[in-house]
Structure formats: structure tokens, C-alpha cells
């Protein structure tokens, strides 16, 4: 056998090159036939009425032909025939790769609520071979479940991702990325998650700055509430008691002037949105007014637990009191 060919893999729409090579040629007729065994080239002449085939080279040792705008129907075995004694035949297989026509991502719900499980589907249509679909949430790879549908040698792949969403996922992209031999680089599509979550409430003491509340001083607390949608209602209440008459409420701020011991108690900031409500408590303890210097030494320790409860413990060495819990977030 001194007739040689090589298999060809080509992307749909591109150019395939078919080469019939002869070692030790005696100038015998070389023919190239298509998978239907119709003659494409007889020596350097193309009898076949398909002008996509063009002669690249013809000599006694090679017949080289290009096929432009390759389609999936061109796939198959192409035969090189060399009419020596005995006649020789060799075939080259053209494999046509078809990149996915369309990549579509579909989220079951435009807006999800924290803790909810949502379904995300990604479909890569009409590729050959079947596409591999990978899922990412931000930079984290997730595992989906793929189904492959075959139709006329083409494959449509649908991958399903079940995703339990958390508030941290709001604004994070869910990325459907395809891997396919006909695709160079990244082919991907993404949708940004919109996650609604109940407010997170945090109380900030904006005055006094040193954090120690004494009789006669003023107190200013600011309630920070973050949620999605943004909380519509932020309210201050005094737990198990009436709000002092000299307290002033201004939006998220609570002012109490001229503090006295009767103001001791728990002050709660409540915030709500359509997802739910949450609150944070501030425990006010009014200390005696200062007598003389030296100034107090204040130590603040913040501990965050998994339930995001913030404990602020303030110890005043001069006051002769035990450390007390000043703020609790819920």
C-alpha cells in the first residue's frame, strides 16, 4: 500500500483539506470520491457539480483538495483511489464539529427570597458533539445535572442547577459556561441573582464618643437597617416601658438629653420589609456623674457569633459596676 490519507476534523463553515498522497508513483490515475462514491476529482479535473471543492495541488504523488464552507452533511468517508496494479484505495474521514448555535440561561424566578431553592437552566442548542456545561456562582464551581437530546446528529444539552440562595448571593452572577471542541476561549452566559432578604439591624452609638453614659449627659443612637428591598419602616421602642418624654425620635436616630437613672432600660430598633422584620436592642445603663479625674479607662470587646448577635461589653474601672451588655442585634 503506497496511498496515504489523513483524517480531518473541521468546524462547520470552515475549510477542510483532503490530501491523497502517493509514495513511489508511476503516474497512475488518482481519484477522490465522496461518501456516496461520486467522483470529486479525476486527476486534476472536477466532474462533481460542487464548486466548494477546489484543487490545491495535483501531481503524480499528490491530489490535494480543499472543501470550503463545510456543513454537517459533508461528514463521512472520502475515498482516494489509485489505479495501480492492483488498484489501491484509502479513505479519510471528515468529522465536522458544530459549535452550539445558542446559549440560553433561564432562571425560574427573577427575584428569590433568602433560603429559597431556585432552579436555573442553561441550554446549549444544536452542537456536535454534545456540549459540556459548567456552572459557576461567582468564582465557585457548582454541580448541575445535564440532559442530552439528539436530533439528526446534533445535540442539545440542557443543564439544571438547583440553587439555595442566601443574602450574600444578591448581585452575584450565575454563569453557564460551555466547553466544546469547536469553541476557543470562553463561551458563557450569565444572569445576576436578585435575592431579597429581611433587614439586618445594627445600632451605632454616635454620642457620647467615649461610650460611657453618665447622668446629665446626652445620648444619641443611630439605627442602621439594611435589607432587600430596603426597609420601609425603622422604629424605636423602649422594651417593657414607655419612651422617656425627653427622648427625641428623628428617622433612624434616637436622642435622649439630660440622661438620668430612670432612663435605664432596653431600647429597641425595629425594621421590616416584605421579607420579614428584625430588631436590635441597646441596653442603656446610666452611670453616676464623674467626681474627679483621673479619667476612666474604657475597654471595648466585640464578639460576633454565628447568629450575628453582637455583644458590646463595656467595663468602667471607676464606676465600681460589673460589665454590662450594652447592645444586642437580632
Amino acid at each position: 500500500q503506497n496511498l496515504f490519507t489523513k483524517d480531518v476534523t473541521v468546524i462547520e463553515g470552515e475549510v477542510a483539506t483532503i490530501s491523497c498522497q502517493v509514495n513511489k508513483s508511476d503516474d497512475s490515475v488518482i481519484q477522490l470520491l465522496n461518501p456516496n462514491r461520486q467522483t470529486i476529482y479525476f486527476r486534476d479535473f472536477r466532474p462533481l457539480k460542487d464548486s466548494r471543492f477546489q484543487l490545491l495541488n495535483f501531481s503524480s504523488s499528490e491530489l490535494k483538495v480543499s472543501l470550503t464552507n463545510v456543513s454537517i452533511s459533508d461528514e463521512g468517508r472520502y475515498f482516494c483511489q489509485l489505479y495501480t496494479d492492483p488498484p489501491q484505495e484509502s479513505y479519510t474521514t471528515i468529522t465536522v464539529l458544530v459549535p452550539p448555535r445558542n446559549l440560553m440561561i433561564d432562571i425560574q424566578k427573577d427575584t428569590a427570597v433568602e433560603g429559597e431553592e431556585i432552579e436555573v437552566n442553561c441550554t446549549a442548542m444544536a452542537s456536535k458533539p454534545a456540549t459540556t456545561i459548567r456552572w459557576f456562582k461567582g468564582n465557585t464551581e457548582l454541580k448541575g445535572k445535564s440532559e442530552v437530546e439528539e436530533w439528526s446528529d446534533m445535540y442539545t444539552v440542557t443543564s439544571q442547577l438547583m440553587l439555595k440562595v442566601h443574602k450574600e448571593d444578591d448581585g452575584v452572577p450565575v454563569i453557564c459556561q460551555v466547553e466544546h471542541p469547536a469553541v476557543t476561549g470562553n463561551l458563557q452566559t450569565q444572569r445576576y441573582l436578585e435575592v431579597q432578604y429581611k433587614p439586618q439591624v445594627h445600632i451605632q452609638m454616635t454620642y457620647p464618643l467615649q461610650g460611657l453614659t453618665r447622668e446629665g449627659d446626652a445620648l444619641e443612637l443611630t439605627c442602621e437597617a439594611i435589607g432587600k428591598p430596603q426597609p420601609v419602616m425603622v422604629t424605636w421602642v423602649r422594651v417593657d416601658d414607655e419612651m422617656p418624654q425627653h427622648a427625641v425620635l428623628s428617622g433612624p436616630n434616637l436622642f435622649i438629653n439630660n440622661l438620668n437613672k430612670t432612663d435605664n432600660g432596653t431600647y429597641r430598633c425595629e425594621a421590616s420589609n416584605i421579607v420579614g422584620k428584625a430588631h436590635s436592642d441597646y441596653m442603656l445603663y446610666v452611670y453616676d456623674p464623674p467626681t474627679t479625674i483621673p479619667p476612666p479607662t474604657t475597654t471595648t470587646t466585640t464578639t460576633t457569633t454565628t447568629t450575628t448577635t453582637i455583644l458590646t461589653i463595656i467595663t468602667d474601672s471607676r464606676a465600681g459596676e460589673e460589665g454590662s451588655i450594652r447592645a444586642v442585634d437580632h
Epitope: D27, T39, R43, F45, P47, Y83
Partner: antibody, heavy 115, light 103 residues
Framework: QVQLVQWGAGLLKPSETLSLTCAVY????????WSWIRQPPGKGLEWIGE???????NYNPSLKSRVTMSVDTSKNQFSLRLNSVTAADTAVYYC?????????WGKGTLVTVSS | PELTQDPAVSVALGQTVRITCQGD??????ASWYQQKPGQAPVLVIY?????PSGSGSSSGNTASLTITGAQAEDEADYYC????????????FGGGTKLTVL
């Protein structure tokens, strides 16, 4: 300048064997197929078959059972034998060079079959 | 025959004439055309898409055409189309021939 020169018996009796030879002068012998075509008087052309230098043949199915083609590469010649001829085989027989199409023809040999 | 031609066609001197050939094999393969004058061997005039020693050819679907522009007296001849069976046998097939008369 390639030339095809053909010869053979011009008058045959029914049941005899027609025998014609065509010599190729100039050009490549192995680089082509070589064909025989006939034309009955006042009628159209009929393809008989073809052969290459290594003896590979392709015959018209309607004549296949009676036709034999052969080649002599040392002389750049190819031959046609048609067995059991009848009056229906009376025709001008042409040899031709095959480049898929027939680009060179011999002058033709009239073969008459008559008792 | 598996290639069909009109038996006879006539054309006025200097005019254009079109000779057609029909057959299934012409869906896949180009036809070649031969001119034959009385007592002579056929001569190749068209092959492939429109490769020509003379004349011009075209092809569409299962029909091939030979067009002679500005017909002259010397164009008067028999014209044969030829192709090959598009099955794997590749046997040669000729049309029945068209007699062209130049008036």
C-alpha cells in the same frame, strides 16, 4: 502531440470475435484511462468500457458478458475483444483517452458483421 | 439513452442556438459535449463547468446546455452530450445526439 492509432479486422461473421487495438504515441500512458466507444451507422455514440495501464477495467453492463479489454504497457497499447458478434455490433469503433471526459479520439475503425 | 437530447435543432446563420441535455446523472456531474461532422471522429468542445476548446456550456439541476453564439455554416454537425452514471459504477453515458442545421 499525443496520437491514437487504431487497427483491427473490419469484416466479421456472426458469432466471431471482434478484436481491435489502439496504440498511444506521446504523452503519459499510465496517467489516464483508455476507452472504447462505438457508433452504429446513422446512430448515436455508445460507451463500451475503459481500462488503465494496470489492467483495471470498467465495462458497460449491457456488454459486460461479451467484452474483454487488455493492456500492453510495454507498447503503450490497449485492446478490445467482443465475443459472439451479431449484426447489431456493426459500428464504427473508436478508441479514446479518458480524462473523465474523452479529450482525444482515434480516427475510428468500421467493423461490419455480416454472414 | 439515459441522457436525453432533442434529435434536431436549427438556427439562422449568425444567430444563437442552445442545445440541451437532460438526465439524472447531471444533478451530480457536469456534462461534456462533442461535435461530430460526417465521416469524422467526435471532437471535444465543452467539459466541466464551462471549460471549452470552443462554444460555451452551462448546467442547472438535471439539465446541461451547449450554447453556440453567432452560428456559422461550419457549426453544422451532430452534437453529443456525455456524462457518467452517478452511482458507483461510473459507467459512461451519451445522449442520443442533436443534429444542428444552420439555415
Amino acid at each position: 502531440q499525443v496520437q491514437l492509432v487504431q487497427w483491427g479486422a473490419g469484416l466479421l461473421k456472426p458469432s466471431e470475435t471482434l478484436s481491435l487495438t489502439c496504440a498511444v504515441y506521446g504523452g503519459s500512458f499510465s496517467g489516464h484511462y483508455w476507452s472504447w466507444i462505438r457508433q452504429p451507422p446513422g446512430k448515436g455514440l455508445e460507451w463500451i468500457g475503459e481500462i488503465n495501464h494496470s489492467g483495471s477495467t470498467n465495462y458497460n453492463p449491457s456488454l459486460k458478458s461479451r467484452v474483454t479489454m487488455s493492456v500492453d504497457t510495454s507498447k503503450n497499447q490497449f485492446s478490445l475483444r467482443l465475443n459472439s458478434v451479431t449484426a447489431a455490433d456493426t459500428a464504427v469503433y473508436y478508441c479514446a483517452r479518458v480524462s473523465w471526459y474523452f479529450d482525444l479520439w482515434g480516427k475510428g475503425t468500421l467493423v461490419t458483421v455480416s454472414s | 439513452p439515459e441522457l436525453t437530447q432533442d434529435p434536431a435543432v436549427s438556427v439562422a446563420l449568425g444567430q444563437t442556438v442552445r442545445i440541451t441535455c437532460q438526465g439524472d446523472s447531471l444533478r451530480s456531474y457536469y456534462a461534456s459535449w462533442y461535435q461530430q461532422k460526417p465521416g469524422q471522429a467526435p471532437v471535444l468542445v465543452i467539459y466541466g463547468k464551462n471549460n471549452r476548446p470552443s462554444g460555451s456550456g452551462s448546467s442547472s439541476g438535471n439539465t446541461a446546455s451547449l450554447t453556440i453564439t453567432g452560428a456559422q455554416a461550419e457549426d453544422e454537425a451532430d452534437y453529443y452530450c456525455n456524462s457518467r452514471d452517478s452511482s458507483s459504477t461510473h459507467r459512461g453515458v451519451f445522449g442520443g445526439g442533436t443534429k444542428l442545421t444552420v439555415l
